[in-house]
């Protein structure tokens, strides 16, 4: 066979569906590898071709469009399963040819089997709730294109296993539910399980979130420098281990950079002659405010080193603040010698 | 709570405590008015755990406030601008969902006149 | 702003008879739909809750349906305590959280 490019497996789309669900797949050449859509191609005379490689096998095969009640069809750019079935995980491949040209794509594909309270190796996009903020919405995800906008369908809304009726402060609206206050307890995974009729057949698509409660944009501050501050002072003799924790206090932020760092004379540590190491631990609050520990540590500190200016900085996107460590030498203890003097007096 | 004649522009605290049960904190307190001889109109919520959300009638305009303590189970509506049109029984309402009220107050009766 | 049309007004049947009382939203609410009891003198009392789930300790012969934008409430085997006047209560939360009670619709038994 003639050349064709090749784009490879796309483990990056891994796709993942439920089995017995009806299931769109649309071909990633033209959303991520082409220039031009499918409506482009095809009036170019370019044929889009699919086949496909299962589980633990090499061999490539054609995709059986001739099963009964058409469960396999390809409509345009997208494959159909109309539903999917658990041995329908393997690699597709969809190829772009004509006599002259050719491009292809593979992906991996996933059926996956659910509890009956939707417990399954699915992974889960992730829905951050502002805390305490008022109305916010989730809506059902990746259901577009399964059903015409002439047909009505209904829509359940679970949390965990149960189903969503009468909550205090979660209302379920068709596609969306509507939080009307998030708290804490609103953490967890939300399904939301879309019921429609077509050709004389009902078809359920099973779509799960997780639902996480972060902090509010409200109670946002700039970073707070916990340690260094005034009341501790880092007295040390040369020779002495030198630690100096700068421990930052960061709110939530969607999308924003915390940053930690130290300077010694107003350079960073990597710029500079000393023996430093700076050891970084980050923990995080039920809301996701951060705190971060950045730790100085030089191992045999000189009295050099104890002049030193140590200031810690910490920047986000609510600002950016900076607070200097009091170093200083301890200052050696006075030495007292008694000298006795010892007369013996001749009689 | 304390109802009574008020005058036309005055102002009014109202407020209601669940007593003989203790109110969770997961409950909407609100609060539904009736004029004399008409039907039912929802003022507005508020969430026991939370005082920062409260949601309101669209008329409501800014003129009445939505309070609540928790360690009392109290919650309270301020009227203020007061007009005769405001002339009605106020109760407040409880309930778990958004208004799904299980428990309602006896009313208190409030008549704004010169 | 929601608003709740109630139809019609006043209704009336004998004893052991059958009512049924619609109520139509101006925007679609879905299920979340509530209906309550008031009796003269007294505070509203909560029937149903998501248009069609029975509250507690309310009889059988109470039921509602519907979804989107229209809903009925169905008092099958009337009796002369049901005699009072009921609302429905629409909950929708398009820009802010919104509730809005229907007119209110006068039940008498015969």
């Known amino acids: 066979s003639e050349r064709c490019d090749d784009w490879g497996l796309d483990t990056m789309r891994q796709i993942q569906v439920f089995e017995d669900e009806p299931a769109r797949i649309k071909c990633p050449l033209f959303e991520h590898f082409l220039k031009f859509n499918y409506s482009t191609a095809h009036s170019a005379g370019l044929t889009l071709i699919w086949y496909w490689t299962r589980q633990d096998r090499d061999l490539e095969e054609p995709i059986n469009f001739r099963l009964p009640e058409n469960r396999i069809s390809k409509e345009k750019d997208v494959l159909w399963f109309r539903p999917t079935l658990l041995n329908d995980t393997g690699n597709y491949t969809c190829m772009l040819r004509n006599t002259t040209y050719c491009s292809k794509v593979a992906f991996p594909l996933e059926v996956v089997q659910k509890d009956s309270c939707f417990n399954s190796p699915m992974k889960l996009p992730v829905h951050k709730l502002y805390i305490e903020y008022g109305i916010q919405r989730i809506t059902c995800p990746n259901v577009d294109g399964y059903f015409p906008s002439s047909v009505k369908p209904t829509i359940t809304w679970y949390m965990g296993c149960y189903k969503i009726q009468n909550f205090n402060n979660v209302i379920p609206e068709g596609m969306n539910l509507s939080f009307l206050i998030a708290l804490i307890s609103n953490n967890g995974n939300y399904t939301c399980v879309v019921t429609y009729p077509e050709n004389g057949r009902t078809f359920h698509l099973t779509r799960t979130l997780t639902v996480k409660v972060v902090g509010s944009p409200k109670n946002a501050v700039p970073p707070v420098i916990h340690s260094p501050n005034d009341h501790v002072v880092y007295e040390k003799e040369p020779g002495e281990e030198l630690l100096i924790p700068c421990t930052v206090y960061f709110s939530f932020l969607m999308d924003s950079r915390n940053e930690v760092w130290w300077t010694i004379d107003g350079k960073k540590p990597d710029d500079i002659t000393i023996d430093v190491t700076i050891n970084e631990s980050i923990s995080h609050s039920r809301t996701e405010d951060e705190t971060r520990t950045q730790i100085l540590s030089i191992k045999k500190v000189t009295s050099e080193d104890l002049k030193r200016s140590y200031v810690c900085h910490a920047r986000s996107a609510k600002g950016e603040v900076a607070k200097a460590a009091k170093v200083k030498q301890k200052v050696p203890a006075p030495r007292y010698t008694v000298e006795l003097a010892c007369g013996f007096g001749a009689t | 709570a304390e109802g009574g004649l008020v005058k036309p522009g005055g102002s009014l605290e109202l407020c209601c405590k669940a007593?003989?049960?203790?109110?969770?904190?997961?409950?909407?307190r609100c609060w539904v008015r009736q004029a004399p001889g008409k039907g039912l109109e929802w003022i507005g919520c508020i969430y026991a755990g939370s005082g920062d959300v409260t949601y309101y009638a669209n008329w409501v305009n800014g003129r009445f406030t939505l309070s609540r303590d928790i360690d009392q189970s109290t919650g309270c509506l301020q009227l203020n601008s007061l007009t005769a049109a405001d002339t009605a029984m106020y109760y407040c309402a409880s309930g778990v969902g958004f208004g799904y009220f299980n428990l309602w107050g006896q009313g208190t009766l409030v008549t704004v006149s010169s | 702003a929601l608003v709740m049309t109630q139809t019609p007004s006043p209704v009336s049947a004998a004893v052991g008879g059958t009512v049924t009382i619609n109520c139509q939203a101006s925007?679609?609410?879905?299920?979340?739909l509530a209906w309550f009891q008031q009796k003269p003198g007294q505070p509203p009392k909560l029937l149903i809750y998501?248009?069609?789930t029975l509250a507690s300790g309310v009889p059988s012969r109470f039921s509602g349906s519907g979804s989107g934008t229209e809903f009925t409430l169905t008092i099958s085997g009337l009796q002369s305590d049901d005699a009072a006047t009921y609302y429905c209560?629409?909950?929708?939360?398009?820009?802010?959280?919104?509730?809005?009670f229907g007119g209110g619709t006068e039940v008498v038994v015969k």
């Open positions: 925007e679609d609410i879905y299920s979340n």
């Open positions: 209560l629409g909950v929708y939360t398009h820009i802010s959280a919104d509730n809005a």
């Open positions: 998501d248009a069609s």
């Open positions: 007593s003989g049960f203790s109110l969770s904190t997961s409950y909407w």
